[in-house]
């Protein structure tokens, strides 16, 4: 008879990702002999809760669980029923929740016990509900790319752990009310809160981190719009032909949009808005986003903001990919240099709204806003964050690495579960032939 | 061509049970969810709950929870909606709805694209 | 939950009229989905996500808005679309329906 080897066990996480505009869990697994080696924790499966995210819950905060169960009970099925009660379960809320706390704390804190309700229903290990701040979304995101991509440490073929040479990727969030960005930087920060000091397998990181608020594609949609209605009597970013009716209201109900709001203005009253595809007067709308007027510190990125010289490569993910991508794949433009990426949006903001619906058929109630989003974006790069083109190179526009969703969820539950240790394994894995 | 063809009229008494079906074809059954919506006599539309085929995930709306079960089975490519014991409000007309959906930035959006034809339940004594 | 309102209840108007509908949500919804039953049909899907068009549905119907204020426009009217009209919502659970605007021949 000879042994039959069984497969080795695996572990299991899941991680809710409550966003702004949706909520996303996340099943992970890995081996559970190989706890500590980088890139092993893979994505098992995932779900989309049906429905917005958590924050817009406020008025109906048990809906906000009620909305989790198709999705929890899915996980019942994919996690195997003897590993439920060692399976870690979390949910971090972002900036839709930051948002809502901001304005609304005890409908915060209702919506968090919601959902809190319906996670401790399941069998899993319940670590809590917390929104997650602006830097913790950052960095775990951070570490999500560079675990995923192995840049933290390698497995040598003698044996031995070592750090490959190729350096750390910074990386780009475009939320829906938030976007972040996270780099690893040799300048020491003038700005205690965007320095994190990371200690992973033995290795020091130094990692410049700026979450900004309001910087969502969402929320930077109605704050254009808000300065839309506020300085033309026509969307300069929407595509001539393209018309919709405007509650004031449902504008100026945002924290985001509160600069633009008036003094006076009828909640209850409705304006008809119509585009006018004009790429000048649509950048210079977006412009107004960011202030370069003053810098308490020796450089600075937007909003007196202190952000070191950008270094290195860099993955951009979520609504950064999903923007380019649109800009590469439905209107076929080239996006690989940063003067491409603004002809390209140029060239979005110049179509009619008929020429748009012609090239992309089927996706009318979105294609309005591609024009002022492909703007934002190409200005948050260059203007914002100060990529030039040589810098720009080195910008990958990515969803996924290594079969995974890049975003902070995976970096979150790493940190959570000890799956990164801060100093090497021990124990060499192999022999050593030295 | 996408269909979904329902069950008959049911005449049914108080305290009765009752299962409708709700057959589909024309697309893969376990890609999309099947919805149910309830409609009673002169009135608006609600939504009763879902099955997930592929999962075999039922979710349902928290007025009708206990009240029914929706259940599929994948082999006939067909969802059901059952009472264990009726009662004379539950008289309406019952539709099963395919969930479509399209994805934009990464996310699913759903909305109602194909509907049955729709069951008339009336309960009396 | 989300409360859908929707104006007129019912309204009478000629074929050739332009006719609209409007949907008042309660709480600020993503999108809206209008939909079309006639006496003894299922609803028919006529617009999805705010302001697309479901496949086969005349370009006389089109949708817009936002937040909590949504339209559906039939730009002239036509003595097949003499119905009842829902709108819908799928951005918060539990998914909910307008009470529905009858639209009758003058």
């Known amino acids: 008879t000879r042994d039959i080897r069984e497969p080795p066990a695996l572990k299991y996480g899941i991680v809710l990702d409550a966003g702004s505009s949706h909520t996303s869990m996340f099943i992970y697994k890995w081996p559970a002999d190989k706890e500590n080696d980088t890139g092993i924790v893979g994505q098992h499966s995932s779900c989309d809760v049906p429905g917005g995210g958590i924050s817009s819950y406020a008025d109906n905060p048990s809906g906000a669980g009620q909305s989790l169960v198709g999705c929890l009970e899915q996980a019942l099925r994919d996690v195997p029923k003897e590993r439920h009660a060692g399976t870690p379960l979390y949910l971090g809320a972002t900036a839709g929740m930051r948002l809502l706390n901001l304005t609304n704390p005890e409908a915060s804190t209702s919506v968090l016990t919601a959902v809190t309700h319906t996670l401790t229903q399941y069998p899993f290990d319940f670590r809590g509900a917390r929104i997650l701040s602006g830097q913790e979304e950052g960095v775990f995101g951070w570490v999500t790319a560079n675990y995923l991509l192995e840049n933290f440490i390698k497995y040598g073929w003698v044996g031995r752990w070592f750090r490959p040479r190729k350096g750390t990727l910074g990386a780009m969030d475009l939320g829906g009310a938030s976007t972040q960005i996270t780099f690893e930087t040799t300048s020491p920060a003038e700005d205690r809160a965007s320095e994190v000091q990371l200690r992973l397998y033995g290795q020091h990181y130094r990692v410049y981190t700026h979450s900004f608020l309001c910087y969502g594609r969402d929320q930077v949609l109605q704050r254009l719009l808000a300065s839309a209605l506020q300085t033309h009597s026509f969307h300069p970013c929407w595509p001539r032909g393209f018309s919709t009716h405007v509650l004031l209201g449902d504008v100026y109900q945002s924290p985001c949009t509160v600069a633009q709001r008036p003094q006076t203005f009828n909640s209850s009253a409705r304006v008809s808005l119509s585009g006018s595809s004009d790429p000048h007067l649509c950048r210079d709308l977006v412009s107004g986003l960011f202030s370069f007027s003053s810098c308490p510190f020796s450089r600075c990125s937007f909003n007196g903001v202190f952000q070191p010289p950008v270094a290195g490569n860099f993955i951009a993910f979520s609504a950064f990919f999903y923007t380019v991508n649109f800009l590469r794949t439905s209107m076929g433009l080239p996006v690989a240099t940063l003067q491409q990426l603004e002809a390209a949006a140029v060239n979005v903001c110049n179509q009619t709204w008929a020429q748009l619906q012609a090239r992309v058929p089927g996706q009318q109630a979105h294609l309005a806003d591609y024009c002022a989003g492909a703007m934002f974006v190409q200005q948050l790069l260059s203007r914002g964050y100060g990529f030039d083109e040589r810098a720009f190179g080195g910008v990958i526009f990515q969803k996924k690495a290594a079969d995974t969703a890049v975003g902070w969820a995976l970096g979150y539950m790493l940190n959570l579960t000890n799956l990164i240790p801060a100093d090497p394994p021990g124990l060499r894995k192999g022999t050593d032939f030295s | 061509e996408v269909q979904l063809v329902q069950s008959g009229a049911e005449v049914k008494k108080p305290g009765e049970s009752l299962k409708i079906s709700c057959k589909a074809s024309?697309?893969?059954?376990?890609?999309?969810?099947m919805d149910w919506v309830r409609q009673m006599p002169g009135k608006g539309l609600e939504w009763m709950g879902d099955?997930?085929?592929?999962?075999?995930?039922?979710t349902y709306n928290q007025q009708f929870k206990g009240q029914v079960t929706i259940s599929a089975d994948k082999s006939i490519r067909t969802a059901y909606l059952q009472w264990s014991s009726l009662k004379a409000s539950d008289t309406a007309m019952y539709y099963c709805?395919?969930?479509?959906?399209?994805?934009?930035?990464?996310?699913?959006?759903?909305?109602?694209?194909?509907w049955g034809q729709g069951t008339l339940v009336t309960v009396s004594s | 939950d989300i409360q859908l309102t929707q104006s007129p209840s019912s309204l009478s108007a000629s074929v050739g009229d332009r006719v609209t509908i409007t949907c008042s949500a309660s709480?600020?919804?993503?999108?809206i989905h209008w939909f079309q039953q006639k006496p003894g049909k299922a609803p028919k899907l006529l617009i999805y996500?705010?302001?697309n068009l479901a496949s086969g549905v005349p370009s006389r119907f089109s949708g817009s808005g936002s937040g909590t204020f949504f339209t559906l426009t039939i730009s002239s009217l036509q003595p097949e679309d003499f119905a009842t009209y829902f709108c819908?919502?799928?951005?918060?659970?539990?998914?909910?329906f307008g009470q529905g605007t009858k639209v009758e021949i003058k």
């Open positions: 709480s600020s919804v993503s999108y």
């Open positions: 819908h919502q799928w951005s918060s659970y539990p998914w909910t």
């Open positions: 709805a395919r969930r479509g959906f399209f994805l934009y930035y990464g996310i699913n959006y759903y909305y109602f694209d194909v």
């Open positions: 099955i997930n085929p592929k999962y075999d995930i039922s």
């Open positions: 996500s705010t302001s």
């Open positions: 024309g697309y893969t059954f376990t890609d999309y969810n």
